[in-house]
Structure formats: C-alpha cells, structure tokens
C-alpha cells in the first residue's frame, strides 16, 4: 500500500480468482483513543472499533472511503483505491490502446518545434468518475524539470456503438535549448483513477522523435504565362523553430485530382516554392518535415487549382 | 562560443555537400545495423545514449546560432558563455568563433573515425561475419575532414589484446551509430546555417 495523495491510498493486488488479497491496517488520524468506530462509504454498518482497523482487501467491494467516527463526529477519512496486477502486468482497463505507432501505445505525444513544449493525448470510453494527473521529467534517475498543465477533455467522437473521449495535456521543459542534442529522454507519467480503480501509464521519448511541424503557411499559386504550369509558394509555419537556416524543413508538394483514384504527382524540395502542372479540378497540397531528422510529416496545407 | 553571422568562405559550400552525404551515410548504416542486429538491443528506446565526445569537444555550444545565444538554457551548460562583439561580425574572414566551431566538428569526426575503425577491426574477426561498417560512411567522414582542412595530430587506432566480445561490440556499434547520427544532424544544421549566413 502507498499514498497517492493526502488520505488517498493505493492497494496493489495480484488479481486472480480466489486471491488472498492484501491485509491493510488503517489508523484514525486523531489524538482520541476510545469510542472510535469505522464505516465504509455511505453505509452506517460499523466495521470495527478502535484507533486502527485491519481489513483484508481482495476485491473492489473492499475498496472505498473508510471513515472513523466518535460520537457521531467524523474524525478522518482514508480512501482506498485498487491497482490490479494481472499475471505480472499492471492492468490497462481505463485507457484505449491507440496501436500507433505500435501496439500498447496508450499515450501519444507530439511537439511542433524544438522549444521543449509538447502535447500528449490519450483515449478512453469512460465518461464519468474519471480523473487524471500528469507528471513529467527529463530523465528518471536525476530528473530535470518539466511542467505540465491539467489534463482536459479535448475531443469526443462516436466510434460504432461507443463514445470515445480524448484527453490532452500540454507540458514544457523548464530549461530547454532548441539546439541541444538530447541524451536523456522525456518521461511522462499519467495517473488515472476511475471510481476505485487506479492505473498508471508512462511514455518515454526524445523531443526529436515526436516532432511534427505545423503545415506550411501562406500557400499561394502564381500561374506561369502561356503554360499549364503554376508556381506554388509557401512559408515556414510560425510555430517552427528559428533560425530557419539552422532548423531547416524539407517539403513535399502533391497535385491530387478530384478523385482519390487519380494518380498523385509528388515533388520533394528544400525550397519554399516549386513549379507544378495544375490539372483541372485538382488541388495542390504541401507538407513539411525536419530536413535532417526524419520524424513525422506535418498535415497538408492545400489550395484548389482553379 | 556562439556562431556569428559571418560572410562565409567560398570553401563553405562543399562542406554543406559533404555534411549532407555524411548524414545520409550514417542514417543508412544505422538502418542496416537495426535490421541486421534485430535480435540485439539496437533501437533508440533500448540503447544507452552515450556521447563519446562529451567533455572532449563542444560542438553544440561552439556552433550555436547567434539567434540562440539569447536563450539562457543554451548557454548554461557551458563553462563560459562567450558572446562575440560587433567587430568580430564585421570580419570578412571566417571569424575566430567559426574556426572554433569547425575545429570542434573536425575533432568529433576524428574521434568517431578512430572508434569506427577500431570497431570494424573487431567485427572482421567475428566468425559470424554478421555486420561490418559501411566503407562509404568511413570515406564520407574522411572527405568532410579533408574539406574542413584542419591539421591535428593523428590519433593512433586503439588496439586491444583481449579476445573481443562480439555481442558487446555490436551493442556498442549501435550506441555509436545512434550518437553519430545525432551529431551528423547537428553538423548538417550548422553547415546549412553557415551556408545561408
């Protein structure tokens, strides 16, 4: 058993049918010695008397808010949560496996640049009685500071019969140098509590590996005289690291017909302009990627050909 | 120890070309190592990230773009934060700071070259003959060193008397390649920045 926060404790259980569970001793936080009784949650049934209460915690029915009283007055509370270990592996019931980029990916994180700011998000089908708290650091043995905000519900989607909820959190490394070569990964730890179930999820990454630039901005077309060709131009996104000559991007320009089946023409360039043939009803899209370290491509910025 | 926006020497552009070749070569070699050594811990998540140039060179700091010298986090890791004055920027010659940056890059390349050659000698003794260093990568390191045109005493190739542990050697190869790829990215950024300045 360990303390998650004041008066909230997590009991770790080897989870299998007929498991013996864990013996837990609760102590009433009071100078009083006599006349103390214990109850669980809203029930008035007295579970025991005395300054300490010994319980065998086996299932969720044994978890909850234990309260010690004296003469009708509440003295203190202890909330017991359960953390299930199933065959040596901690349970992952609360969050959905996003399966991207690989199986057992519960937390996904992205950064728009090298400033040390990043966003993480996760999915769940649970809508109520759910709380998250997020901590982060650079490295784990001698951790350096990363400050995270509160996790917020950022999107709701309908997936088949189920509703899916997306939560996200923004974090900022306290002292980040965009040019630094990372040798210690960022660690992100999410504590999730659903009713009386506790779970924790972690992700470990280098900022360089989670870079996804914003799409190029000010995408414009300039028709070339007496030609079906157009000059496409764009700019680096405002959120990208500067100077751009050091933090350079490479670009992919795509001409896509109205039908998804039509052949796509693609051009790769390090410049911020390109000459392409604009077909009728087609659209031109441009996306960006770090020129020197191949992390994710940005989303497409698009303009119609007409 | 930051990089001023100086007028580059005409010799800077070949360095950009060579540094791009270097990044391509080390990336290809790392990909090959990951595939060939699939039963070894060779992914970024599995290896310890070690920098053999740590405390020996200071490429990131010496080659810091001028725009980042205002960022305290980029300076506090250095023993001295050295902001060049205006007179340095006016110089038509490669400034003292740029020379410091390029010599630091040269020293990096020299250290990795020695490590890779020592490692290749061990890998050639492996009866499994599972993986060797790409000669193209070693050649590209050499080309960039020549383009940088610094003279420094040659470091003798390390020789080891004891029987090599091939498992450990292959894991060390992965560690080296990961670190060298990261340094090659920095070198490419620096050359691109100098080329644009």
């Amino acid at each position: 058993i360990w303390e998650l926060k004041k008066d909230v404790y997590v009991v770790e259980l080897d989870w299998y049918p007929d498991a013996p569970g864990e013996m837990v001793v609760l102590t009433c936080d009071t100078p009083e010695e006599d006349g103390i009784t214990w109850t669980l949650d809203q029930s008035s049934e007295v579970l025991g008397s005395g300054k300490t209460l010994t319980i065998q915690v086996k299932e969720f029915g044994d978890a909850g808010q234990y309260t010690c009283h004296k003469g009708g007055e509440v003295l203190s509370h202890s909330l017991l949560l359960l953390h299930k270990k199933e065959d040596g592996i901690w349970s992952t019931d609360i969050l959905k496996d996003q399966k991207e980029p690989k199986n057992k990916t519960f937390l996904r994180c992205e950064a728009k640049n090298y400033s040390g700011r990043f966003t993480c998000w996760w999915l769940t089908t649970i809508s109520t009685d759910l709380t998250f708290s997020v901590k982060s650091s650079r490295g784990s043995s001698d951790p350096q500071g990363v400050t995270c905000g509160a996790a917020t519900l950022s999107a709701e989607r309908v997936r088949g019969d189920n509703k899916e909820y997306e939560y996200s959190v923004e974090c900022q490394e306290d002292s980040a140098c965009p040019a630094a070569e990372e040798s210690l990964p960022i660690e992100v730890m999410v504590d999730a509590v659903h009713k009386l179930k506790y779970e924790n999820y972690t992700s470990s990454f280098f900022i360089r590996d989670i870079i996804k630039p914003d799409p190029p901005k000010n995408l414009q077309l300039k028709p070339l005289k007496n030609s079906r060709q157009v000059e496409v131009s764009w700019e680096y996104p405002d959120t990208w690291s500067t100077p751009h000559s050091y933090f350079s991007l490479t670009f992919c320009v795509q001409v896509q017909g109205k039908s998804k089946r039509e052949k796509k023409d693609r051009v790769f360039t390090d410049k911020t302009s390109a000459t392409v043939i604009c077909r009728k009803n087609a659209s031109i899209s441009v996306r960006a990627q770090d020129r020197y370290y191949s992390s994710s491509w940005s989303e497409w910025a698009s303009v119609p050909c007409s | 120890r930051n990089l001023p926006v100086a007028t580059p020497d005409p010799g800077m552009f070949p360095c950009l070309h060579h540094s791009q070749n270097l990044l391509r070569a080390v990336s290809n070699m790392l990909q090959k190592a990951r595939q060939t050594l699939e039963f070894y811990p060779c992914t970024s998540e599995e290896i310890d990230h070690e920098d053999i140039t740590k405390d020996k060179t200071s490429t990131v700091e010496a080659c810091l773009p001028l725009e980042l010298t205002k960022n305290e986090s980029c300076l506090n890791s250095r023993e001295t934060s050295f902001i060049t004055n205006g007179s340095c920027l006016a110089s038509r010659k490669t400034s003292f700071m740029m020379a410091l940056c390029l010599s630091s890059i040269y020293e990096d390349l020299k250290m990795y070259q020695v490590e890779f050659k020592t490692m290749n000698a061990k890998l050639l003794m492996d009866p499994k003959r599972q993986i060797f260093l790409d000669q193209n990568m070693l050649a590209v390191i050499d080309e960039l060193m020549q383009a940088l045109n610094f003279n420094s005493e040659t470091v003798p190739q390390k020789s080891s008397l004891e029987e090599p542990d091939f498992y450990k050697t292959k894991i060390k190869l992965c560690i080296l390649l990961h670190a060298f790829r990261i340094r090659a990215v920095t070198i490419d950024r620096v050359m691109s920045y100098l080329n644009a300045s």
């Epitope: 080897d14 989870w15 299998y16 049918p17 007929d18 498991a19 299932e59 969720f60 270990k85 199933e86 065959d87 040596g88 592996i89 019931d93 690989k102 199986n103 057992k104 089908t125 | 039963f39 811990p41 599995e46």
Partner: antibody, heavy 115, light 112 residues
C-alpha cells in the same frame, strides 16, 4: 472454490458452426479476464482468444480471426466461444481458463471437425 | 507459430535432477514473466511455477523455475515416477499481450 465447467463440444462437419460454453462458479466472474486455449491431438497448447472482464476488448489468434467469436454473459457467469466455418485443423480439446498469475482451467471439451 | 522453444524430450532416472529450457526473445521472455505447466495425459494443464520462480501452494518444492535474459528453465530436483508428463512454458509478447505464448512442450520420461 473456483470451478469452470465446459460444455458444447462434439463432432461437426467442415464449414459448420459450434458454440462452446464455460460456466464459472466460486468467484466473482465479472471481475476477471478469460481465455480459450486449445490442444490438437498429440500436439502442444495453442492460445485461441481472450476477453476482458467487462467484455470491452477481445483478442484472437490469427488462425481463428474472423471465424471465432469470444463473448461472455456476466449475469449468467458464462463464457462462450462461437466457432464458424470450422476446418479439420480446428479439431482439438478446447479449454477455458481464468487470466492471472494463478489460473484455473476447465476440464476441456473435444471438438472434432470431420466429414 | 511457436516462438518459445523447448527441447522435445528429456529423461532421467528417479532421484536425478532434470532441467527443461525455454528459449524466447527480447519482446517475450525478455520483457515478461514466465509460467510453467505440467500436463498429465488426458487432463488439463496444472500450474507449477508463476512469475518466473514462484511456486503455488501444493506444488512440491522439487520443482523450481528461473529466468535469465531471454530464456527460462524449469528444474526438477530428484525426479519421481509421477513427474512423467508434458511440460509447457508460457509467457507473453509485449506487442500482443494478453495473447498467451506457449512453448513447444517437453516430454519428461522417468527411466527405470
């Protein structure tokens, strides 16, 4: 004590369907994940499928994906395996088992796919 | 499709020490726990070892398990006639958990 009693096995022709049941008692069935494991005659153990305690997630071996469906009825304390498009290679003893460091197995039920 | 490899058979005389190996990889045994089962003819498998080296109550202490790196082993110290059975190791793969990965199985024969 924990008990898993299986039923539903038998002889079936290729291409036909069969449903296996596993009735649980002696524990809070709705709190635990459950597996199906099979063993072809004279062969080793092969995992077939898994279902979470609440039925929210199901996982299948590639060899049965799209043909077999694992399900549970927590109100009846029963686990099911619906097998469709059966093949000769599905002939085996099928076991249900609880998920956890200590597990409990059903007695097994024989499924024979033969024309 | 077996990723955990066991020797097909091992044998020993009563009182001898018999060991069965179970060889896997970094993504299974290397990063997950191992169980061992005993299966007597015509019966369901019986758990012998869980979490690499733990013995459930009721399992004789002549059975012991260990794990090192990407392999595990089961030792029967002082093998007895009633130990003649098939033995299976079981683990998970970190990418496909909770799918069970079983070993190929080992037939233990007690001679004489």
């Amino acid at each position: 004590q924990v008990q898993l009693v299986q039923s539903g096995g038998g002889v079936v022709q290729p291409g036909r369907s069969l449903r296996l049941s596993c009735a649980a008692s002696g524990f809070t069935f709705s709190s635990y994940g459950m597996h199906w494991v099979r063993q072809a005659p004279g062969k080793g153990l092969e995992w077939v499928a898994f279902i979470r305690y609440d039925g929210s997630n199901k996982y299948y071996a590639d060899s049965v994906k799209g043909r077999f469906t694992i399900s549970r009825d927590n109100s009846k304390n029963t686990l099911y395996l619906q097998m469709k498009s059966l093949r000769a290679e599905d002939t085996a003893v099928y076991y249900c088992k609880t998920h956890g460091s200590h597990d409990n197995w059903g007695q097994g039920t024989m499924v024979t796919v033969s024309s | 499709s077996y990723v955990l490899t066991q020797p097909p058979s091992v044998s020993g005389t009563p009182g001898q020490r018999v060991t069965i190996s179970c060889s896997g990889g970094r993504s299974n045994i290397g990063s997950n726990t191992v169980k061992w089962y005993q299966q007597l003819p015509g019966t369901a498998p019986k758990l012998l070892i869980y979490i690499n080296d733990q013995r459930p109550s009721g399992v004789p202490d002549r059975f012991s398990g260990s794990k090192s790196g990407t392999s595990a082993s089961l030792a029967i110290t002082g093998v007895q006639a009633e130990d003649e059975a098939d033995y299976y190791c079981q683990s998970y793969d970190r990418g496909t958990h909770p799918a069970l990965l079983f070993g190929t199985g080992t037939k233990v024969t007690v001679l004489g």
